[in-house]
């Protein structure tokens, strides 16, 4: 029962992570610049994302512009785009794998296979979490590096945008959720009585012994 609870929690976390990742990738708030004159009033705010950039004037008026040419974009931006999309697709694949092996589905009947699918989905979610983390950390590193580099003029200095924080949250949720799914079946799903064994047992349930419980010295 605890295992089922962990599975549900794991999937809920990964779903939240996926939604966070989607929002993070879509929002044009990876890099933020607040252009401030000598007064404390912000003249304008520029948001830059993976797909577009937006300018918010002090009047509140906002204008967004989708990046024109794919080839004209910096390579790190192209890589971030690709990794973001791949991470989301990998997480979706992980969800499909999980659904195939979930306790409440009948896609796969055999309990061992179900456990293996859940474990696989957990690993896939962890991979998705890592893939989400790469562009977010890379972008954050570039922003921080440029911010403290005296050779970068003020017009080129940026700050960490909300999308990066969402990306970190997404990655954390995917890693945590995937980790929980991996933990629900530590020994390939053989920790409990087999579905068939339980049906024919008499007084004591037959517990299958793990390979490590047999003496191995006779099998050199």
């Amino acid at each position: 029962m605890a295992s089922a609870g962990m599975q549900i929690l794991g999937v809920v976390l990964t779903l939240l992570g996926w939604v966070n990742g989607l929002v993070s990738c879509a929002l044009p708030m990876w890099k933020v610049t607040a252009f401030i004159g000598n007064s404390i009033v912000v003249a304008q705010v520029v948001w830059e994302g993976l797909w577009m950039s937006c300018v918010v004037q002090s009047t509140g008026q906002m204008q967004c512009k989708v990046y024109d040419s794919l080839l004209a974009l910096p390579q790190d931006l192209q890589a971030a785009r690709a990794l973001c999309v791949i991470a989301l697709l990998v997480a979706l694949f992980g969800l499909l794998v999980y659904l195939a092996g979930a306790k409440c589905t009948t896609c796969v009947e055999e309990k061992d296979s179900k456990a293996r699918l859940v474990l696989t989905s957990g690993i896939v979610f962890v991979i998705s979490g890592v893939l989400t983390l790469i562009p977010v950390c890379w972008t954050a590193h570039a922003i921080i590096r440029d911010f403290y580099n005296p050779l970068v003029a003020e017009a080129q200095k940026r700050e960490l945008g909300a999308s990066l924080y969402l990306g970190w949250a997404a990655s954390g949720l995917l890693l945590l959720g995937g980790g929980l799914l991996c933990c629900t079946c530590p020994s390939g799903g053989s920790q409990g009585p087999s579905h068939y064994m339980a049906r024919y047992s008499t007084s004591a349930p037959a517990i299958s012994r793990g390979p490590s419980e047999y003496p191995t010295k006779n099998y050199v």
Epitope: F35, G37, P150, L151, A153, A155, Q156
Partner: antibody
Framework: EVQLQQSGPELVKPGASVKISCKTS????????RHWVKQSRGKSLEWIGT????????RYNQKFKGKATLTVDKSSSTAYMELRSLTSEDSAVYYC?????????????WGQGTSITVSS | DIQMTQSSSSFSVSLGDRVTITCKAS??????LAWYQQKPGNAPRLLIS???SLEAGVPSGFSGSGSGKDYTLSITSLQTEDVATYYC?????????FGGGTKLELK
């Protein structure tokens, strides 16, 4: 007192190269970036490029890429600028300047200037 | 590149005059502007940074103002030692660019 001491005037032939120096004193050499600025006779000022004495990282004005090379020697607190393939257009006074700490592309201290004359 | 335009290349002035030198940027430079004074045969000297902040040792008769694209250097009462060429420079974006200079000449 902050001082930027530049090397003396140079008379060079067309096509030749020249390397001018800028020795600093009165502050920690690696704390501020170093700029080089060109002033042709009776004309305005043109930024050539900048170097971070900490790590030798450079940025150049597109116009001077391939013409100027900036280097530093931390041990002697000296910045250098080499100009190559000189033509009469390169005859000018060249200044080394120190970037303002909080606004590095502003220039708070200037060397006395090095006059380069390109003539055959 | 950002273009810096100083509308007057030279000014005929008298001692004691209030002098105003203007500088216009081709785009908003968010007050990242410096003013320099250069006397013949000398290197430029920084007077004002951040459009309005007077550097240490600069006489209080100098002041800077402006925002956005338009900036002004003012000298309240011109002294003999103020006769020089004045340059504005933006340091908002690279490459940093200078105005063409405004030369003050005594009438």
């Amino acid at each position: 007192e902050v001082q930027l001491q530049q090397s003396g005037p140079e008379l060079v032939k067309p096509g030749a190269s020249v390397k001018i120096s800028c020795k600093t004193s009165g502050y920690t050499f690696t704390e501020n970036i170093r700029h080089w600025v060109k002033q042709s006779r009776g004309k305005s000022l043109e930024w050539i490029g900048t170097i971070n004495p900490n790590n030798g990282e450079t940025r150049y004005n597109q116009k001077f890429k391939g013409k100027a090379t900036l280097t530093v020697d931390k041990s002697s607190s000296t910045a250098y600028m080499e100009l190559r393939s000189l033509t009469s257009e390169d005859s000018a006074v060249y200044y080394c300047t120190r970037g303002i700490t909080k606004s590095p592309y502003g220039m708070d201290y200037w060397g006395q200037g090095t006059s380069i004359t390109v003539s055959s | 590149d950002i273009q810096m335009t100083q509308s007057s290349s030279s000014f005929s002035v008298s001692l004691g005059d209030r002098v105003t030198i203007t500088c216009k940027a081709s785009e908003d430079i968010y007050n990242r502007l410096a003013w320099y004074q250069q006397k013949p045969g000398n290197a430029p000297r920084l007077l004002i940074s951040g459009a309005t902040s007077l550097e240490a040792g600069v006489p209080s008769g100098f002041s800077g103002s402006g925002s956005g694209k338009d900036y002004t250097l003012s000298i309240t009462s011109l002294q003999t030692e103020d006769v020089a060429t004045y340059y504005c420079q933006q340091y908002w974006s690279t490459p940093p660019t200078f105005g063409g200079g405004t030369k003050l000449e005594l009438k």
